[in-house]
Amino acid sequence: ILGGREAEAHARPYMASVQVNGEHLCGGVLVAEQWVLSAAHCLEDAADGKVQVLLGAHSLSQPEPSKRLYDVLRAVPHPDSRPDTIDHDLLLLQLSEKATLGPAVRPLPWQRVDRDVEPGTLCDVAGWGIVSHAGRRPDRLQHVLLPVLDRATCNRRTHHDGAITQRMMCAESNRRDSCKGDSGGPLVCGGVLEGVVTSGSRVCGNRKKPGIYTRVASYAAWIDSVLA
């Protein structure tokens, strides 16, 4: 997260760290007791490593009573996701067992009504992604509030030049932005999961390159079918 601040510890109990061989790779969001939603491209970076999910964490390194690392029983990328595009960039991870819920571990309600969030709405994005252009990684969860950007502006040639489909949404990126390592994390508007950080190799913090988020409401049928 660029231009953000440290999050209040455990105030986002839905927040997950998707890890490979014990290292943070991507963000994720607990959407059901045994399921974490993340970004499909995160799996590509995992190669043949062991994928696990950390729940109940604030610090990645320090011991915390609520922290627990779960093995992944099943990884289900969206069937239409492709390595060369950010389309359908969603991944569902089934935990090896149901998460132990509590004040620091709780699923987040996700948007089912397929309607665009009003431009200008302030939404919260959180993650353990890099906090500087130099690539510094934080130990503790960071967050930032970002205004939603209308799709027409996001589709301008100097922004994302028509690449933003109706299944995506954008948020402003003027110094405050999601960045490398935040992919798969949640964009939360009014206490509801609206978007998932896409995992393209986008420049961060440049206002002409807004953050791109996969709209979960657009994938309600797929999410329901996997969770069923």
Partner: antibody, heavy 116, light 112 residues
């Protein structure tokens, strides 16, 4: 299939105004800026301005400020350009184009002829 | 405004020949985001312009690979490796990095 359908040719008198339209088909109108260009006979293209179909906010080439006014009607997925105080210099083909990707989609053009 | 100067004004070619069109901008057209918004359009008689190349060298979908774009800073080139009859028309370069966006004066590709 993306299509931009422009209104038909206009013959107008000097000093009058004209409003030409550009109706969008095959995509969500509010997802892309609409741009307008002018091409006089045998000449190159000039950018007039653009409009955000969500907010109605328009940007103009300084050269066309006071001459062109851009508006949209979201309910009919239509962009409009009004040209006022017309002179023979304004006789041209006027194009609308969708921005994103680049100017990949253009209307067929509207010929405006200013003549007494 | 950024002036886009195209040369030549007219380019007579034989079918199957290579054609090369130059476009020079009066100032650098590298955008503040690092990208260069230089595009090429082909306008056939009585038609609207068609996008060929965007961001200097990227072919738009459906554009044959005989079209290629290159250049940087202020100097750009469009090459057509083997001219076909359907390629005839007026070619325009365009910069979208600075406001107002501007087009070149055009190069007419015609049969020798």
């Amino acid at each position: 299939e993306v299509q931009l359908q422009q209104s038909g040719p206009e013959l107008v008198k000097p000093g009058a105004s004209v409003k030409i339209s550009c109706k969008a088909f095959g995509y969500t109108f509010t997802d892309y800026y609409k741009n307008w260009m002018r091409q006089r006979h045998g000449e190159s293209l000039e950018w007039i301005g653009d409009i955000n179909p969500n907010s109605g906010d328009a940007n103009y080439n300084q050269k066309f400020k006071g001459k062109a006014t851009l508006t949209v009607d979201k309910s009919s997925s239509t962009a409009y350009m009004e040209l006022r105080s017309l002179t023979s210099e304004d006789s041209a083909v006027y194009y609308c184009a969708r921005e994103g990707p680049s100017f990949a989609y253009w209307g067929h053009g509207t010929l405006v002829t200013v003549s007494a | 405004d950024v002036l886009m100067t195209q040369t030549p004004l007219s380019l007579p070619v034989s079918l199957g020949d290579q054609a090369s069109i130059s476009c020079r901008s009066s100032q650098t057209i590298v955008h503040s985001n690092g990208d260069t918004y230089l595009e090429w359009y082909l306008q056939k008689p009585g038609q609207s312009p068609n996008l060929l190349i965007y961001k200097v060298s990227n072919r738009f979908s459906g554009v044959p690979d005989r079209f290629s774009g290159s250049g940087s800073g202020t100097d750009f080139t469009l090459k057509i490796s083997r001219v076909e009859a359907e390629d005839l028309g007026i070619y325009y370069c365009f910069q979208g990095s600075h406001v107002p966006p501007t087009f070149g004066g055009g190069t007419k590709l015609e049969i020798k």
